[in-house]
Interface confidence: medium
């Protein structure tokens, strides 16, 4: 709390300018009118106030707007945004994408702070859904943003927004998140031709079911091993050796290097050794010749 003291003669601020940067804490409190500050917030960012001075300016705004700052002030907070607590931000009603961009710019280059997370949450909730422009903005500043959302939150992403997603935005997504995103991506890219479709859908395939992988295997897509290794194990297991060979194309040789890792290891255990041998890669661990395979899960489903 800053002590209330009278402003010294001749020091009353008529505008927010550089002359204030050497004001003591108490002088700023006494000589800067909060309403003036609010109307000239855009100038604050251009003036290298010290952290101590920013504390005083924030205190003045807090007194002027106890219920939360108006968007006209929020948009011009600049570095003062870094002084805000999540509690402060929860009082705000941010509706403009320009305001969001301005505040994200201040935090650029840093990890997502609790303040930024709260700001984004308030913004998205206010909009009701994660539209394309918002997603575009958020992933530009935080490539990992999508993967920080729960599957429930991701369900509010409209398929049209998927166009804004870049492969690196999905790097840290887990299978549960890709399960939600994949159907949206499939819908978003459905009108594209084969090779273009595969380029776009590739990074979402960690959520693809078996039937879609089977369909892709008929399209000469030449899936790379890195993508194959991210596929759901339960989606890969039912694929035949021929289907995997078609799916991977020339990359099929990479299976040997990955034979001890999932999903390749589990897939090998489900294939007949005869079929694996046709690949000529020396893959071992398949079902020996003459053995009968009972699919107990299918039997249970029928009974």
């Amino acid at each position: 709390e800053v002590e209330k003291t009278a402003c010294p003669s001749g020091k009353k601020a008529r505008e927010i300018d550089e002359s204030l940067i050497f004001y003591k804490k108490w002088e700023l409190e006494a000589c800067v009118d909060a309403a003036l500050l609010a109307t000239q917030m855009d100038r604050v960012n251009a003036i290298p106030f010290t952290y101590e001075q920013l504390d005083v300016l924030k205190h003045k705004l807090d007194e002027l707007y106890p219920q939360g700052y108006p968007e006209s002030v929020i948009q011009h907070l600049g570095y003062l945004f870094l002084k805000m607590s999540p509690e402060d931000i929860r009082k705000w009603n941010v509706t403009s994408l320009e305001t969001l961009k301005a505040l994200l710019e201040v935090n650029k280059g840093h990890e997502m702070s609790p303040q930024v997370a709260t700001l984004i949450d308030r913004f998205v909730k206010g909009r009701g859904q994660l539209d394309k422009d918002t997603l575009d903005t958020l992933t530009a500043f935080y490539p990992g943003y999508l993967c920080s959302l729960s599957p429930e939150e991701l369900s509010s992403v409209p398929p049209s927004s998927i166009w804004a997603v870049r492969p690196q935005d999905l790097d840290t997504c887990d299978p549960r998140q890709l399960d939600v995103l994949y159907p949206k991506a499939r819908l978003a890219f459905q009108n594209m031709n084969g090779s273009e479709y595969f380029v776009k859908i590739q990074s979402f395939l960690g959520g693809a079911p078996t039937e879609d992988l089977k369909a892709l295997s008929q399209q000469n897509v030449s899936m790379d091993l890195a993508t194959f290794m991210k596929l759901r194990t339960d989606a890969v297991l039912p694929l035949t050796v021929a289907e995997v060979q078609k799916l991977l194309g020339p990359h099929v040789e990479g299976l040997k290097a990955e034979e001890r890792h999932r999903p390749v290891r589990d897939w090998i255990l489900r294939q007949r050794q005869d079929d694996l041998d046709t690949l000529g890669l020396g893959l071992q661990g398949g079902i020996p010749n003459g053995y009968l395979v009972l699919d107990l899960s299918m039997q249970e489903a029928l009974s």
């Epitope: 300018d17 550089e18 002359s19 204030l20 940067i21 050497f22 003591k24 804490k25 290298p48 106030f49 010290t50 952290y51 101590e52 001075q53 920013l54 600049g78 570095y79 870094l82 201040v106």
Partner: antibody, heavy 121, light 107 residues
Framework: QVHLVESGGGVVQPGRSLRVSCAAS????????MYWVRQAPGKGLEYVSA????????NYADSVKGRFTISRDNSKNTLYLQMSSLRAGDTAVYYC??????????????WGKGTTVTVSS | DIQLTQSPSSLSASVGDRVTITCRAS??????LNWYQQKPGKAPKLLIY???SLQSGVPSRFSGSGSGTDFTLTISSLQPEDFATYSC?????????FGGGTKVEIK
Amino acid sequence: QVHLVESGGGVVQPGRSLRVSCAASGFTFSGYAMYWVRQAPGKGLEYVSAITTNGGSTNYADSVKGRFTISRDNSKNTLYLQMSSLRAGDTAVYYCARGAPGYRGYYMDVWGKGTTVTVSS
Amino acid sequence: DIQLTQSPSSLSASVGDRVTITCRASQSISSSLNWYQQKPGKAPKLLIYAASSLQSGVPSRFSGSGSGTDFTLTISSLQPEDFATYSCQQSYSTPLTFGGGTKVEIK
């Protein structure tokens, strides 16, 4: 190449005046706050004075307040420190430094090599 | 004015050693602390600003940490060119103040 070059130092008697200068080059001088920092023989660095980009606002350490005046001429890319009523305790290497603004306040990212001021009778 | 106390005032170390220098502020200064290196007869050089941000061109063996009142400068593996005096400076409020310096000497 960003450069700051101080000049004007020398030996001066107590009570007399001296003006030191700092010529800046390689950057937009008018876009930066500037500082004078000094270092007495065998001692640490001591903040002396600062001036805003347009010269409209200045600040001084208590030890020099009322005796030293900082100023700048943006058309000449030059910073000045007018020192009067000099004392033996003002003997030091005087460095000119550029203030790099950040939201956590100023730090000095470019320094000159310094000019030596010796106050002695 | 905010006082900054550095410790130790001097230390002896060998090439390859990990060196830690501390700076304590007389009141909380958030992350408004900067570190400088100075060699005899030379101008100070900015190493770290805002407590932990490495100035462009400074080797990554230098790192800074801390916030509030306690700060640390660490040199992960001391090199021959690192023997110098290191000073901290606060930019939380004016007047700006410096610590007394820590001289790093060859053992």
